[in-house]
Interface confidence: low
């Protein structure tokens, strides 16, 4: 016996989030892994007094303690609908079925005399049917439904007389059923029997407040189990050759401060006082844990040396329950001021360390949903995925000997103190119906798939490819708005005067009269932050730099009456100096952010984008920029993420759609102006960039979620893409969905009606498709009332905790970008596509491993889209160059311009043009390739100010 569980809270220093296996493991379970599902008799059988069944303490407790619950008769009626349960088991394809025998159904008053024939027949029929189906029965003798007569006559488990009566009952079961049962559980979760039955009074028999009674009950439960184990071991195991254990339940707990030894001590005490209370005598040294003995000496019974010897080792495997009953409500004593956690993997590690690596059967695991949830139990899928992933990691990475898993529960039923207010079944049962049909929930479909694949064998992404992007591919980096320096930071050579310093000892400069020096013209390098930009860009080794102009700086009045020439000069310098390094610019004219609309003040005060005249003002501004910078800039983005302005214009859906309409018009006017006036001479290309995250159904088994995913894309991307790329009008699906809600009185929103002239204006006003892609969202349908864009979509988002995510909870789902690119091509035809922003926030200031991982994986998927799907992908712009203070850390450089290691990673991908085969020699010609000029680089860095 080792007893070293507390070591689990000393965190593994090798944990790295980008080793995805430590978050979610795509792997299979061991070959003969035992997949099962369970129920408790009282929860599902119903028929509480049918065919001679006696009352249990729970039947009595329901009538006396639980308000609004008449009986368990309204449950799933498994006693009547045995065939339906068997069909449900067939559907899922389990290897075993764990169920409990109702003691009072066999022996109405608890005493073993002549068994109730109908009860005996029911269990015998069930066992025969399971054997016939090759489903192994795991039978629990006691799942809380003590015959009421034993409670009334003896005081229930407080009285050690029950030990022998329980042993008689067990003996009968072994005799009658042991030929067909190879796995026995004596008692299900004795902690809850003792603590809630006699401590909190939340469970039957509903006694509370007597701590001595709580530990007496626990003591008798342990002794009863031990007696039955020895009985089975001596008299039945030799010829029945089965195994027997007791199911022990627990929570898990994490210290408030992971380095604090006192907090760790409290966590250990917490686990010991719940799980150790029963596990230590049975799986440990035969006695209660030392901490409990010291703390509870006045109420905790004592095991004699002979009894310790008798208790020790009385389980053939460790049966472990990890579910809501041990978490809600968790008494304050067990928490000890620390943090309750659902980390099953760590709980299993604790058992491994504390009890010398036993074989473990997870005898109950699952969570619950609200009773209103019927078959679409989406969150249950993710809870199951998370738990199963943790079990798989425990087996594969921690070498824990888990041999089986019991999903809980087969059916919706009576949930103890929660009665019928929650559901735990994988099959939905309408308790008010007569036929009690078992309808598979999404979680049943999911579990079925897990069993069929014996784990998580289906990787969502295809294997990595080797290959290269084309020679003219744009390798870019994106920056948000560049604020122009209003005055050159270095006035050196522009002032003709000569000065003497400290001539009179006052430490001031004194001008020397009568002397005039030669000045020199202003230079781009007079702007200090341009120098910084160029140094960063040179280190990035990119071919393209995307940045945004500040409209409000260029045109402070919003019209051409006051042009800030200095700002335009600054931007021209950024572009021209970049070109000297072989870095072309992609310039964004307007880059609003959630915090800052970025409009000139007068336009902002005139209702901003709710005012159609803003579109005309934008056209004038665009024309000025094309005129001043267009000879150097060949790629233009008019507006960055207009589809995200709904975050700002969100007072109503009509505001959102009105603003979007004016943004579309603004873009189209600018594009038409470029097309007519500037394209012939400048030969550039103009588009707008859309925020384009991919969407997947949160619940792949729910048709409504598939429709919600498509609807997300319609409302998010097609909203702008359809009018510009395709029809000149909003997507029919989006228009109809909003209209449908309008008709039902669920929303007063309406998409603007476009005139024929507007449709002609909008249609075809893009030269390429520009997408900002960061993540994939998991969406579900939820009918929402209200007249805002967000509620018009009827969409809710789900965070999958098993996925690698950033500090701002952006999930790393590389295959989403490939799906997006294919979707765009399928919907809008074969056109040039640029990913104009793509990146992730990473807390690391130096070794930003998450960003490297993200870049490598996402670029792999983009390469697949290019090589396999033949998508015309022309460029990838990583987001972003430098981070901003106190904002999520998206930058390759810190806010004080320190380089992170992801830069070298990106350099390598760029210089390789992707992920080439070993010794690949497909080089680009010198003119096509952006060769790095070391002299240029040197000059950039050393240029004097």
């Amino acid at each position: 016996f080792s007893g070293d569980g507390r070591a689990i809270w000393s965190k593994n220093p090798n944990f790295t989030p980008v080793n995805e296996s430590q978050l979610f493991l795509y792997d299979t379970f061991p070959k003969n892994f035992f997949w099962g599902i369970g129920t408790g008799a009282l929860q599902v059988e119903g028929s509480w007094k049918k065919d001679g069944k006696g009352p249990s303490i729970w039947d009595h407790f329901i009538h006396t303690h639980l308000k609004n619950v008449s009986s368990t008769n309204g449950s799933s009626d498994s006693y009547i609908f045995l065939e339906k349960d068997l069909s449900a088991l067939d559907f899922i394809g389990v290897s075993f079925y764990q169920f409990s025998i109702s003691w009072p159904r066999l022996f109405p008053d608890g005493i073993v005399t002549v068994a109730n024939a109908k009860g005996l027949q029911y269990y015998s029929t069930l066992l025969d049917a399971l054997v016939l189906r090759n489903i192994e029965p795991i039978v629990t003798l006691y799942h809380w439904d003590l015959p009421l007569a034993l409670q009334e006559k003896y005081g229930g488990w407080k009285n050690d007389t029950i030990i022998d009566i329980f042993n008689d009952y067990a003996t009968y079961c072994f005799q009658m059923f042991g030929d067909r049962v190879k796995y026995w559980i004596t008692i299900h979760n004795p902690y809850l029997v003792a603590w809630h039955g006699y401590g909190t009074g939340m469970h039957a028999p509903g006694e509370k407040g007597n701590l001595a009674a709580v530990y007496t009950v626990g003591h008798n439960l342990i002794k009863a189990h031990s007696k039955v184990w020895h009985n089975y071991n001596t008299h039945f195991r030799p010829h029945q050759k089965g195994w027997l254990s007791i199911t022990l339940g627990s929570h898990w707990i994490e210290p408030n401060r992971s380095e604090n030894t006192m907090d760790i001590f409290k966590c250990q005490q917490s686990m010991v006082s719940v799980l150790g209370w029963f596990a230590n005598p049975i799986h440990g040294d035969g006695d209660y844990p030392e901490g409990m003995r010291k703390k509870l000496f006045s109420v905790l019974p004592i095991f004699s040396e002979a009894e310790k010897h008798e208790m020790r080792g009385t389980a053939d495997f460790f049966a472990f329950s990890f579910g809501p009953n041990n978490f809600k409500p968790l008494n304050t004593m067990a928490k000890m001021g620390q943090n309750v956690s659902l980390n099953l993997r760590e709980a299993l590690n604790w058992i491994k360390l504390e009890y010398n690596n036993p074989r473990i059967l997870i005898a109950e695991n699952g969570w619950f949903t609200d009773s209103r949830v019927k078959t679409e139990d989406t969150t249950a899928i993710y809870m199951m995925k998370n738990f199963l992933s943790q079990v798989l990691q425990a087996i594969r990475l921690d070498e824990i000997r888990v041999f089986g898993y019991t999903a809980w529960s087969l059916l919706d039923g009576f949930e103890w103190q929660d009665a019928y207010t929650i559901r735990r079944g994988l099959f939905y049962v309408d308790f008010n119906s007569k036929q009690k049909e078992r309808k598979p929930k999404s979680s049943a479909h999911y579990y079925k798939q897990i069993i069929r694949e014996n784990g998580f064998s289906l990787k969502e992404s295809t294997p990595d490819v080797q290959g290269q992007f084309p020679c003219d591919f744009s390798w870019g980096v994106t920056e948000s708005v560049l604020k122009p320096e209003s005055v050159a930071s270095s006035p050196q050579f522009s002032d003709p005067h000569l000065y003497v310093w400290n001539a009179t000892g006052n430490r001031l400069l004194h001008r020397v009269e009568g002397v005039r020096l030669k000045t020199r013209p202003a230079q781009c390098t007079d702007f200090v932050n341009i120098k910084k930009q160029l140094e960063m860009l040179a280190r990035m080794k990119v071919t393209h730099y995307r940045f945004a102009l500040d409209w409000a700086s260029v045109l402070p009045t919003g019209n051409l009456s006051a042009v800030n020439r200095q700002a335009l000069r600054y931007y021209r310098c950024v572009v021209s100096e970049g070109l000297k390094l072989g870095i072309s610019a992609m310039v964004t004219l307007y880059y609003p952010t959630h915090a800052h609309l970025g409009l000139p003040e007068p336009l902002l005060h005139a209702d901003g984008w709710l005012n159609p005249s803003t579109a005309e003002a934008f056209q004038a501004y665009a024309g000025l920029c094309f005129q001043e910078l267009g000879d150097l800039v060949k790629l233009w983005i008019t507006i960055n993420e207009p589809n995200r302005l709904s975050d700002i214009y969100n007072r109503s859906g009509n505001d959102t759609y009105g603003a979007a309409h004016n943004l579309l018009v603004a873009h189209a006017l600018a594009w038409r102006l470029y097309d007519r006036q500037f394209r012939p001479s400048q030969r550039g290309a103009v588009s707008l960039s859309l925020h384009a995250d991919w969407a997947e159904p949160a619940n792949p088994y729910a048709d409504s979620h598939w429709r919600a995913a498509e609807r997300f894309l319609q409302f998010e991307i097609a909203w702008f893409a359809e009018p510009l790329f395709k029809t000149g009008d909003y997507p029919a699906a989006m228009r109809e969905y909003i209209a449908s809600k309008h008709r039902r009185g669920l929303s007063s929103s309406a998409l603007p009606r476009l005139t024929e002239a507007e449709r002609r204006l909008l249609k075809g006003t893009v030269d390429f498709c520009a997408l900002n892609h960061f993540t994939t969202r998991f969406v579900m349908h939820e009918q929402l009332a209200g007249s805002r864009y967000d509620s018009d979509r009827d969409i809710q988002f789900l965070q999958d905790i098993t996925r690698l995510s950033s500090p701002t909870r952006l999930a790393v789902i590389p295959w989403g970008v490939r799906k997006l690119l294919r979707w765009v091509r399928r919907n809008y035809g074969d056109m040039d596509i640029y990913i104009t922003a793509s990146g992730i926030d990473d807390q690391a200031l130096e070794d930003d491993r998450l960003r490297k991982y993200y870049l490598g994986k996402y670029l792999q998927e983009v390469l697949k889209a290019y090589l396999i799907d033949k998508v015309r992908i022309k460029g990838y712009y990583a987001f972003k160059l430098a981070e901003e203070k106190s904002k999520p850390r998206f930058g390759f450089f810190t806010s004080d311009f320190k380089a992170k290691s992801s830069i070298q990673f990106y350099n390598k991908v760029i210089s390789s043009r992707g992920f080439p085969f070993e010794n690949s020699s497909s080089r680009c010609s010198q003119t096509q390739e952006n060769t790095e000029c070391t002299v240029c680089l040197f000059l950039v860095q050393k240029k004097p100010l």
Epitope: D703, W706, R707, A733
Partner: antibody
């Protein structure tokens, strides 16, 4: 142009299994917005829905006939197949397949295209 | 399961307005679709989503739905409108399609 065409035996004997095929053209069965239903109509009687297959391969069956029906699809062949076991003379009817499309509403916006129907007689 | 009730028959003179009802428990919260079926032909969708008309269906066909009754209204009835009319909903609870029992519209004269 969107069309659906039912095919199958004209005559089946009692207790036999009926297999009907619906071949579609003008749209794809794996389009996330499309589902296909089978409906039947005994002579002189009302329409009776039998089964539906959703885009994601989820299936739904009429409660009264569930034990006898199986619906499936072969996307590559653009076919939806319905099998009905243990046929009885009362199953004599015209069998239709029909397409449902999701547009703006929460569910399918009606069955917008129907096949011309195939008449099946059950007799010994 | 959900039940839709239609009158077996409705008669109307040419040029008049015909109203065919479809009753169901709280049907106003469901989307109702209407089909026209002429003898020997497959049904044709004439109104979907309570009140929308597919392209090619005359404006004379309209629908409404509230409370426990949905109504198909055919104004300026013509002889060619004589047919059986069926209402239909999706029972989202069970994912089942439910049809009404059908109404025979007779155009008098």
């Amino acid at each position: 142009q969107v069309t659906l065409k039912e095919s199958g035996p004209v005559l089946v004997k009692p207790t036999e299994t009926l297999t009907l095929t619906c071949t579609v053209s003008g749209f794809s069965l794996n389009n996330a917005r499309v589902g296909v239903s089978w409906i039947r109509q005994p002579p002189g009687k009302a329409l009776e829905w039998l089964a539906h297959i959703f885009s994601n391969d989820e299936k739904s069956y009429s409660t009264s006939l569930k034990s006898r029906l199986t619906i499936s699809k072969d996307t590559s062949k653009s076919q939806v197949v319905l099998t009905m076991t243990n046929m009885d003379p009362v199953d004599t009817a015209t069998y239709y397949c029909a397409r449902s499309v999701v547009t703006g509403g929460y569910y399918y916006d009606g069955m917008d295209v129907w096949g011309q129907g195939t008449t099946v007689t059950v007799s010994s | 399961s959900y039940v839709l009730t239609q009158p077996p028959s409705v008669s109307v003179a040419p040029g008049q307005t015909a109203r065919i009802t479809c009753g169901g428990n709280n049907i106003g919260s469901e989307s109702v679709h209407w089909y026209q079926q002429k003898p020997g032909q497959a049904p044709v969708l004439v109104v979907y989503d309570d009140s929308d008309r597919p392209s090619g269906i005359p404006e004379r066909f309209s629908g409404s739905n509230s409370g426990n009754t949905a109504t198909l209204t055919i104004s300026r009835v013509e002889a060619g409108d004589e047919a059986d009319y069926y209402c239909q909903v999706w029972d989202g609870e069970s994912d089942h399609v439910v049809f009404g029992g059908g109404t025979k519209l007779t155009v008098l004269g």
